[in-house]
Amino acid sequence: MAVTACQGLGFVVSLIGIAGIIAATCMDQWSTQDLYNNPVTAVFNYQGLWRSCVRESSGFTECRGYFTLLGLPAMLQAVRALMIVGIVLGAIGLLVSIFALKCIRIGSMEDSAKANMTLTSGIMFIVSGLCAIAGVSVFANMLVTNFWMSTANMYTGMGGMVQTVQTRYTFGAALFVGWVAGGLTLIGGVMMCIACRGLAPEETNYKAVSYHASGHSVAYKPGGFKASTGFGSNTKNKKIYDGGARTEDEVQSYPSKHDYV
């Protein structure tokens, strides 16, 4: 019961996390900027992984997509890649985990197969969460190191001057959504991995005493079959006994003090 709950909760948490990663990737507010030196109107600029937007206090808003792939900063490309990998892994993980859920019966799927699938999806969720956290962190680091209060001046060779606009670059909402979503996916993945341990059937050795009818060569031996999981080495389903007692493969059974009860 606890295993099913852990697995189900892990699935739900991961589902919410992956939805958050998708939302963060699509959001425009990765970086927000106030353009200080504009004497006309308050200009608010915000940028995502796919497009940049300008919003003015007058209500005017315009967004423009980054239509080129080659000219963009390498960091932006890296963040895009990390987020997409996170989404793809998460989506595959969700698909696998649906079939792995203990509460869903699919044909004659054994618990061992479900355990394997649960572990696989858990690992995928963990990697997906890490990708999202890494992507968001790389972007945040890019903002902090490269852009915080840029005010440097420079001059062009054409004689016209160019200077960087004094802007305050702040973390956009998407960064926080991404961090939380990545964390949730990670936690969900860990929960799935924990649930996997409970799902995996244990190999139980049943100890049995051999009962022999006197003067007969066939031994009656109750119980003693190893639980067949497909993982163990007991391929012939031989009975397992204490103290080196003989198996039924042996031709002859000799009387012992245990034969007469």
Partner: nanobody
Framework: QVQLVESGGGLVQPGGSLRLSCAAS????????MGWYRQAPGKQRELVAV???????NYTDSVKGRFTISRDNAKNTVYLQMNSLKPEDTAVYYC????????????????WGQGTQVTVSS
């Protein structure tokens, strides 16, 4: 990489009109505010008029009612229609644009043109 080219300056009589234009070219991603500044001999550079991408305009008090700023976002061009010109309007007029580049759409730059001379004299 990015060029701002002003045109339309010249000599005009008091009360006359001129239309300045400034075209931005190069690897521009998005232009936000565009404006005109002027610098008279021996004076500081001052704002004449500025217009945002959305069309919100602002003028210095001395030109209000006489000058009109407009822009064409598709052409990355800003215009300054100057009517009822006075001798005190004589200056070098500089075009200015806040923009970001295709190679770095996360950083804003202010580019300036080289200026065009406007002389109001009888």
């Amino acid at each position: 990489q990015v060029q701002l080219v002003e045109s339309g300056g010249g000599l005009v009589q008091p009360g006359g009109s001129l239309r300045l234009s400034c075209a931005a070219s190069g690897s521009i991603f998005l232009i936000n505010a565009m404006g005109w500044y002027r610098q008279a001999p021996g004076k500081q550079r001052e704002l004449v008029a500025v217009i945002t991408r959305g069309g919100s305009a602002n003028y210095t008090d001395s030109v209000k009612g006489r000058f009109t700023i407009s822009r064409d976002n598709a052409k990355n061009t800003v215009y300054l229609q100057m009517n009822s010109l006075k001798p005190e309007d004589t200056a070098v007029y500089y075009c200015n644009a806040d923009l970001n580049l295709r190679s770095d759409p996360f950083k804003w730059y202010t580019f300036w043109g080289q200026g065009t001379q406007v002389t109001v004299s009888s």
